[in-house]
Interface confidence: low
C-alpha cells in the first residue's frame, strides 16, 4: 500500500533570463528512495540515483544544476521553459510517486517579486 505523499513548490513563476529551483519532498512513508527522475513534459532533464549519483541529460547540462537536495536548479530561463515539470520518485517497496510543478517564465517586469528561487 502506498502511503507517501509528495509535496512540491506548486505553481511558480520566474523571470526570463533568471533561475529557479524546482523542489519536491516525499513524506509519510518509510519506503527507500532508489531514484528520482526530473522530467519536463516528455523530456528527461536529470536523474538522481541512490547509488550512482546525478546524471544530467546532455541537452540540458549547460542550464541545469543538481540540488539543493533532490531538487533541480534551472538557469538562463526562456519563455520556452514554461510548462509542467515532474519529479518521479522510484521507491522500494512502494513503487512510483509523482509530483507536478507548473513553471511560468515571464518577462522581467511581470514576474512577482519573491516568486523566484523557491527555496525551503
Amino acid at each position: 500500500m502506498m502511503t507517501g505523499t509528495i509535496e512540491t513548490t506548486g505553481n511558480i513563476s520566474a523571470e526570463k533570463g533568471g533561475s529557479i529551483i524546482l523542489q519536491c519532498h516525499l513524506s509519510s512513508t518509510t519506503a527507500q528512495v532508489t531514484q528520482v527522475n526530473w522530467e519536463q513534459q516528455d523530456q528527461l532533464l536529470a536523474i538522481c540515483n541512490a547509488d550512482l549519483g546525478w546524471h544530467i541529460s546532455p541537452s540540458f547540462k549547460d542550464r541545469v544544476a543538481p540540488g539543493p537536495g533532490l531538487g533541480l536548479t534551472l538557469q538562463s530561463l526562456t519563455v520556452n521553459d514554461t510548462g509542467e515539470y515532474f519529479c518521479i520518485y522510484h521507491t522500494y517497496p512502494d513503487g512510483t510517486y509523482t509530483g507536478r510543478i507548473f513553471l511560468e517564465v515571464l518577462e522581467s517586469s511581470v514576474a512577482e517579486h519573491g516568486a523566484r528561487f523557491q527555496i525551503p
Epitope: G53, W54, P66, G67, P68, G69, L70
Partner: nanobody
C-alpha cells in the same frame, strides 16, 4: 551531527580574489555533489555554482569565467575560488549538498573600495 561550515569570506577590493571553503562533516556517505548559493542584502538567495563528485561543474552566467568551484572528495570539502570580484558579488555565500537539505551559517563576502 551533520553540518556544513563555510569560511574564507571577508572584505576585498574590486578586482580582487577570495577563496571560500565548505567543510562537510558527520555524513554516513560522501555527498554526490556540493554547491554554492549567495544572498545579497534585500535580494533572493541565488545559485552560484555546483560540482559533482566526479568533477563536473556548473556556473551561473553572472560568475562564469571568474569563479571556479572544486571539491576534495577525500575531505568532503568544496572550494569556491572567486577572481575579478565586483561590488555586485557582495553577499552571504552558503554551501549546500545533496546530503543536507538545509544551509550552513554562511560566510560574508564584501567587495568594496
Amino acid at each position: 551531527e551533520v553540518q556544513l561550515v563555510e569560511s574564507g569570506g571577508g572584505l576585498v577590493q574590486p578586482g580582487g580574489s577570495l577563496r571560500l571553503s565548505c567543510a562537510a562533516s558527520g555524513f554516513t556517505f560522501s555527498p554526490s555533489w556540493m554547491g554554492w548559493f549567495r544572498q545579497a542584502p534585500g535580494k533572493e538567495r541565488e545559485w552560484v555554482a555546483s560540482v559533482l563528485r566526479g568533477g563536473y561543474t556548473w556556473y551561473a552566467d553572472s560568475v562564469k569565467g571568474r569563479f571556479t568551484i572544486s571539491a576534495d572528495n577525500s575531505k568532503n570539502t568544496a572550494y569556491l575560488q572567486m577572481n575579478s570580484l565586483k561590488p555586485e558579488d557582495t553577499a552571504v555565500y552558503y554551501c549546500t549538498t545533496d546530503s543536507l537539505p538545509g544551509w550552513g551559517q554562511g560566510t560574508l563576502v564584501t567587495v568594496s573600495s
